[in-house]
């Protein structure tokens, strides 16, 4: 598994400060785990990165992800004046130059090396829940969220709003 060291946290801060031509509001280095406290880990296999959802052994170090937060206009903005209808989007990067991407055709979540500006597939609308968990909705496919399926991350369609709190799309962010 790999992650970002404390030193890298500062040396790569803001990724040149411009991903979509706008600067992030903030960046946050955190470990990502599921609602049921399984860790999201990243491993290099056959020259590509795999994403796993697994129980860590005691004292095993958690992988870290750099979350960059951006403000964006919400598409259903009725007022049209730019004041209303803002949303918070994040990109997730577990190591330099690699970002989580939504592959909507395959319903999969993948790690891709990419150039800036990042494609829309790398952006996720952030939702925070009463449980203080978060969920990540695809910018490119509203109603589709990063979720857990068969010990992997996958894209999960939330058919109705009643399922927004379903455990398999809820994640915890932790500094430790």
């Amino acid at each position: 598994a790999f992650g970002i060291s404390g030193v890298q946290k500062y040396t790569r801060a803001l990724h040149d400060s411009s991903i979509t031509g706008i600067s992030p509001i903030t960046e946050y280095l955190a470990s990502l785990s599921t609602y049921n406290d399984q860790s999201i880990t990243f491993a290099l296999e056959d020259e590509s990165y795999e994403i796993y959802v697994e129980d860590l052994k005691k004292d095993e170090k958690k992988d870290k992800v750099l979350l960059s937060y951006y403000e964006s206009q919400h598409p259903s903005n009725e007022s049209g004046d730019g004041v209303d209808g803002k949303m918070l989007m994040v990109t997730l990067s577990p190591t330099k130059d690699f970002w989580l991407h939504a592959n909507n055709k395959e319903h999969s979540v993948e790690l891709h090396k990419c150039e800036k500006p990042l494609p829309d597939q790398a952006f996720f609308v952030l939702h925070n829940m009463h449980s203080n968990c978060v969920s990540f909705e695809c910018k490119t496919d509203p109603g589709v969220f990063i979720g857990v399926k068969d010990n992997h991350l996958a894209l999960i369609k939330v058919d109705s709003s009643e399922n927004l709190c379903t455990e398999n799309i809820l994640f915890k962010l932790s500094e430790t």
Epitope: T26, E78, S79, M87, L88, H127, S131, E162, L164, C165
Partner: antibody, heavy 122, light 107 residues
Framework: EVQLVQSGAEVKKPGASVKVSCKAS????????MNWVRQAPGQGLESIGD????????FYNQNFKDRATLTIDKSTSTAYLELSSLRSEDTAVYYC???????????????WGQGTLVTVSS | DIQMTQSPSSLSASVGDRVTITCHAS??????LSWYQQKPGKNPKLLIY???KLHTGVPSRFSGSGSGTDFTLTISSLQPEDFATYYC?????????FGQGTKVEIK
């Protein structure tokens, strides 16, 4: 233009219940949680809780868990706060407020109702 | 719960003064802090969100800074209409919590 319009002032006796309404317009009602905040005379702001209009999921501040009930009527884009077993300390202005960000509480409250004064007196 | 502590609880200042109000969070809230202005008999108005982002229509004499646990609201040159009570509020985690307020009065 986004507006949150609340019901009028109420005077209640101790032990009674009160139901305050908040009618939203100018935005997609189900996209943003509706929050309720109260302010006793000369005091600060205190969060009561909020409700997700999409699924009715509620959160109550510990102080209000047993006595507050948050509901919504999607057909009229109206949120309701009901507070039961009223006591004199519940005398306050009650506000509804909407989050700044779609789906997230991180940006604070951008739109507020005008407030509803609830007076509890015997 | 995250406790929000504002200081001072009140201050007296003159028109043209630079005024600074601080807010301390009991745990890390990143930049997820908002500042509000409230005048007597009125509802609160959002001034600053995400610690430093000025809400639309708010005069540029208002500014916010900070991240983690310590935050500051600054009014660079106090105007007559700025005499009011100011509140900070964290949006990072439930329950959402406010500071106790800072009343800015005329000296």
């Amino acid at each position: 233009e986004v507006q949150l319009v609340q019901s009028g002032a109420e005077v209640k006796k101790p032990g009674a219940s009160v139901k305050v309404s908040c009618k939203a317009s100018g935005y997609t009602f189900s996209d943003y949680n509706m929050n309720w905040v109260r302010q006793a005379p000369g005091q600060g702001l205190e969060s009561i809780g909020d409700i997700n209009p999409k699924n009715g999921d509620t959160f109550y501040n510990q102080n209000f868990k047993d006595r507050a009930t948050l509901t919504i009527d999607k057909s009229t884009s109206t949120a309701y706060l009901e507070l039961s077993s009223l006591r004199s300390e519940d005398t306050a202005v009650y506000y509804c407020a909407r989050h700044y960000y779609y789906g997230s509480s991180y940006g604070g409250f951008v739109y507020w109702g005008q407030g509803t004064l609830v007076t509890v007196s015997s | 719960d995250i406790q929000m502590t504002q200081s001072p609880s009140s201050l007296s200042a003159s028109v043209g003064d630079r005024v600074t109000i601080t807010c301390h969070a009991s745990q890390n809230i990143n930049v997820w802090l908002s500042w509000y202005q409230q005048k007597p008999g009125k509802n609160p108005k959002l001034l600053i969100y995400a610690a430093s982002k000025l809400h639309t229509g708010v005069p540029s004499r208002f500014s916010g800074s900070g991240s983690g646990t310590d935050f500051t609201l600054t009014i660079s040159s106090l105007q007559p209409e700025d005499f009011a009570t100011y509140y900070c509020q964290q949006g990072q985690s439930y329950p959402l919590t406010f500071g106790q307020g800072t009343k800015v009065e005329i000296k």
